[in-house]
């Protein structure tokens, strides 16, 4: 009896997620998902922020692009999960 994640009407088992952490399509608003040694990476489309690109950036805020975390070059996707 596997616990399942639900995303866009798709049920995905924990085993599937471990094999392909991008299977659940976790990156919102057109963010691109990349498999990564620590799980997955969301590269946010311009104007979005957050680990899963779930937040629209307020236009008066600072740069919409997050600073690259250690080990990732600027412009590289954000890691998540």
């Amino acid at each position: 009896d596997h616990h399942h994640h639900h995303h866009e009407q798709k049920l995905i088992s924990e085993e599937d997620l471990r094999a392909d952490p991008c299977a659940a399509r976790p990156c919102a608003h057109g963010g691109r998902c990349y498999a990564h040694f620590s799980g997955l990476v969301c590269a946010c489309a311009p104007g979005y922020m957050g680990a899963r690109c779930e937040f629209p950036v307020h236009p008066d805020g600072a740069s919409a692009l997050p600073a690259a975390p250690p080990g990732l070059r600027p412009g590289d996707p954000q890691r998540y999960l």
Epitope: S38, V57, H58, L81
Partner: antibody
Amino acid sequence: QVQLVQSGAEVKKPGASVKVSCKASGYTFTSYYMHWVRQAPGQGLEWMGIINPSGGSTSYAQKFQGRVTMTRDTSTSTVYMELSSLRSEDTAVYYCARGEAVGGNYYYYGMDVWGQGTTVTVSS
Amino acid sequence: DIQMTQSPSAMSASVGDRVTITCRASQGISNYLAWFQQKPGKVPEPLIYAASSLQSGVPSRFSGSGSVTEFTLTISSLQPEDFATYYCLQHNSSPYTFGQGTKLEIK
């Protein structure tokens, strides 16, 4: 230890602005998002918005758009939440809460550490 | 916005009871759900993240389950310090939204 220390209580007149601070210690300030949540007397919790302390980008709940501004000072590891055009309904306890790692991590532990809260009273 | 509906809004129980609180999301949120405990005049304390994972230091009598739109927080054997208000939080999409709270009182 990881700690968020907020500024003291404020009493404001309707129409005024208030700026609440939240000083982080015990972890790398720029590596975690920061949320702001408020709670009116006897009411539930309400999410206001989020700031990325690294780049300074923000996102606000629609309800507060145009009235709230979240900023940060990386030199002092402090985030600020300013709310303008105050009205009596803004009387609440305002909390900062640490969110997810900016760089991501395998699990979500978001809002795992909260400030002690800042009481803002709006009264004429 | 995603609406989070908790039930019951309030309940009374006795020490040693098994208690279940439900949180329903108005649309699917995968397992992006957290639970918090708040005592009067105190700061919310995180209990559960990712619907079913216990935050560090939280007693094992607390457990979470569910996915998509239906979630539960269970306290297997109520202790005196568990009487408080409990909130669920969806962090699937912006704006993050909390349930209205469930106040757990001593019977």
